[in-house]
């Protein structure tokens, strides 16, 4: 009893400590650690039935998918997978958890968002944070130097997500990557083409793909006077330019990150520029930037990339944006991010980005991190932010009040009179065996009205009605639910007629 009282006091004290730290705006890491301690204390306390009733809910940052949401999701996945396959990708899968060591040192500041699993008999494990690092591990482990693959799976991040904006702790990523030594910018251009094809097919609104290159960023920081040790942290400040003003970014770089104001101003002259191939040409003439080897390589590759994007017919969707500085540590070359555009309030205003829906880039060093000899396998890829897309599609369908079918049933086997259950069971079985998606109501003697109502609600287009007279005549009454039109179909022709009406191929190939 004393033990429980002590633990209860500790839980109370720890709760106060957490609240205090939040009020003081203590570092996120410290708050996270103290919250984790609080949870461990509570776990030791265990349930006290007299005090607390278990709240039935999904864990923070997760959700269930209803049949309606799943229908949306499957449609989205279908568009994406068809595109990936059209571009000749193979598919792989990897474990949901990896050895902790595999994920360590690959994500920079984001490493603190990795979920560690409680030790299970010796191996220190973590849930995967993305699909790219496991892919690199897969390549290194199998000594592969060449593959074009896609991978659709859930990833896990200990984020504090704004779920209303389609962000979660468990979410799907849809990745497409090309690994191998190829001529410059051809695979990169294809990745951007894929991104544009998918976003256009999904019809979620106008979008823009921002493109930059890690080498240009690094070269620019070098000529502006940023020390190597500050590159990554300054990158993360610059990357905020799509959300906040240059003034705020500059204040962060100078005030919080210790950058000299004149260095920040030099960076500002560059990162506030965006345009097309003409900006690439302009920067190639820049007296300082063109003297930097890294930047020059990056600009040369971008010039080539824009040529290919023009040939692919998507150059109008691409913007060279010097403020794009994607957070992950492993990018080495071209980087890109697709944002949806809000229609401007007034004509003449610049379109406003409403958040990233796809992103990617070149990461030539990641596989080498896993290879004992450090052998590199150049890679480039993209990731579609499907959770964001699900949210947008769901909202759009709700706004349109569109009915979404959650099943694919083509026909309901119904009866007009009593005592026909055996006949319904025989017919539904025949239909299933012929590859028809069919259902029946689980009642011996259902009312015809109830059966028709069920079809209306479930969006089932056809009803196959069995009656005593129809049985004698060897026919089935086939009724269209929407037009209410009925025709007698010979039983042996029923399968073919249903397939014809529902546009299904006549053989199950």
């Amino acid at each position: 009893m004393a033990e429980r009282a002590a633990l209860e006091e500790l839980v109370k004290l720890q709760g106060e400590r957490v609240r205090g730290l939040k009020q003081q705006k203590a570092s996120a890491e410290l708050i996270e650690e103290e919250v984790a301690k609080l949870l461990k204390l509570k776990a030791q306390l265990g349930p006290d039935e007299s005090k607390q009733k278990f709240v039935l809910k999904t864990p923070k940052g997760t959700r269930d998918y209803s049949p309606r949401q799943m229908a949306v999701r499957e449609k989205v996945f279908d568009v994406i997978i068809r595109c990936f396959k059209r571009h000749g990708a193979e598919v792989i899968d990897t474990p949901v958890f990896e050895l902790k060591e595999t994920l360590m040192g690959k994500y920079g500041e984001d490493s603190k968002l990795i979920y560690d699993l409680k030790d299970q008999g010796g191996e220190l494990l973590s849930l995967r944070y993305d699909l790219t690092v496991p892919f690199a591990r897969y390549l290194a482990m199998n000594k592969l130097t060449n593959i074009k693959r896609y991978h659709i799976a859930k990833v896990y991040r200990r984020d504090n997500p704004a779920m209303t904006r389609g962000r979660y702790r468990e979410f799907y990523q849809c990745d497409f990557d090309i690994a191998g030594n190829f001529d410059p910018m051809i695979p990169d251009a294809e990745c951007l083409k894929i991104m544009c094809e998918i976003l256009s097919s999904l019809q979620i609104g106008d979008f823009l793909v921002k493109v930059n290159d890690r080498r240009i960023l690094d070269g620019m920081f070098a000529i502006c006077g940023v020390s190597d040790s500050k590159f990554r942290t300054i990158c993360s400040s610059v990357d905020k330019l799509d959300k906040v003003s240059w003034e705020e970014v500059k204040n962060e770089m100078v005030g919080e990150k210790g950058l000299a104001p004149e260095v920040a101003d030099r960076i500002g002259d560059y990162v506030q520029q965006h345009g097309g191939v003409s900006l690439v040409e302009q920067l190639l003439q820049d007296p300082k930037l063109s003297q930097n080897k890294q930047a020059l390589e990056g600009l040369g590759d971008l010039k080539l990339l824009f040529e290919y994007l023009t040939l692919f017919g998507i150059d109008d969707k691409i913007s060279f944006d010097l403020s794009l500085a994607r957070g992950l540590d492993y990018y080495t070359g071209v980087i890109y991010e697709a944002v949806l555009l809000q229609t401007p309030a007034q004509a003449g205003e610049e379109p406003l980005g409403v958040g990233s829906v796809a992103a990617g880039g070149r990461y030539d060093g990641l596989v080498g991190m896993f290879d004992p000899k450090g052998r590199k396998v150049p890679c480039v890829g993209l990731s579609i932010g499907v959770e964001r897309i699900f949210s947008i599609v769901e909202q759009r369908l709700e706004a349109l009040e569109e009915k979404i079918r959650t099943t694919e049933t083509q026909v309901l086997v119904a009866s007009a009179q009593k005592k026909l259950l055996e006949e319904r069971l025989k017919l539904v079985s025949e239909l299933w065996d012929a590859g028809i998606k069919a259902e029946l109501l689980y009642k011996k003697n259902p009312k015809l009205l109830n059966q028709l109502q069920y079809c209306e609600e479930a969006g089932i287009p056809l009803v196959a009605i069995i009656g005593e007279q129809e049985l004698k005549d060897g026919v089935i009454k086939l009724r269209s639910v929407t037009s209410r039109e009925e025709v007698d179909v010979r039983r042996e022709d029923l399968v073919e007629e249903i397939k014809r009406r529902t546009g299904q191929p006549l053989c199950i190939c």
Partner: antibody, heavy 120, light 107 residues
């Protein structure tokens, strides 16, 4: 019963290195935060470093930060302290200690200590 | 860093006496305080945690009180085995710091 046994102490020259180990038994090691606490001869106690149950969090007192590294191997029920660039003022008995109620920074269980002497 | 100051530095007392040792924190630490007993050549032993909770197996003659910045350890009736050095420690924020110790000697 809970047992913590330190090893690895000894005499080392200034600038040298030592690795202390602590073998734990009698409890579920992977559930507990662990720490190293030291006591210079005839002096008080100083909390040197701690490590969380999964190694996600580690902290060091200012005087050792950058020179000492705390680590653990949950599979082996072992805690370690890698001490580099040792100084005369690091001379002390080093205790391995287990947190109270898994996460409370109060040393509930202590080892017998291992003496580290830094001297030329 | 939070400084912990114990008083007195040493105290002489006899078996059966009531002894009080105080500990002051340089800033508020709520109830995040522990008391330890250490005998020569041995590791410290936990007596009291979060200011007033008696560690299991510790005799009830030991008690702790206080919160914020001022704390006390009281031994209601000294026993021969209680002669040792006593330390307080704050567990509020890292670096966790100990008092300089109070040596309890036989009068």
């Amino acid at each position: 019963q809970v047992q913590l046994v330190e090893s690895g102490g000894g005499l080392v020259k200034p600038g040298g290195s030592l690795r202390l180990s602590c073998a734990a038994s009698g409890f579920t090691f992977s559930d507990y935060y662990m720490s190293w606490i030291r006591q210079a001869p005839g002096k008080g106690l100083e909390w040197v470093s701690y490590i969380s149950d999964s190694s996600r969090y580690t902290k060091y007192t200012d005087s050792v930060r950058g020179r000492f590294t705390i680590s653990r191997d949950n599979a082996k029920n072992s805690l370690y302290l890698q001490m580099n660039s040792l100084r005369a003022e690091d001379t002390a008995v080093y205790y391995c200690a287990r947190y109270l109620y898994q996460v409370i920074a109060i040393a509930k269980s202590w080892g017998q200590g291992t003496l580290v002497t830094v001297s030329s | 860093d939070i400084q912990m100051t114990q008083s007195p530095s040493s105290v002489s007392a006899s078996v059966g006496d009531r002894v009080t040792i105080t500990c002051r924190a340089s800033q508020g630490i709520s109830s995040w305080l522990a008391w330890f007993q250490q005998k020569p050549g041995k590791a410290p032993k936990l007596l009291i945690f979060v200011a007033s909770n008696l560690e299991s197996g510790v005799p009830s003659r030991f008690s702790g009180s206080g919160s914020g910045t001022d704390f006390t350890l009281t031994i209601s009736s000294l026993q021969p085995e209680d002669f040792a050095t006593y330390y307080c420690q704050q567990a509020n924020s890292f670096p966790y710091t100990f008092g300089q110790g109070t040596k309890l000697e036989i009068k």
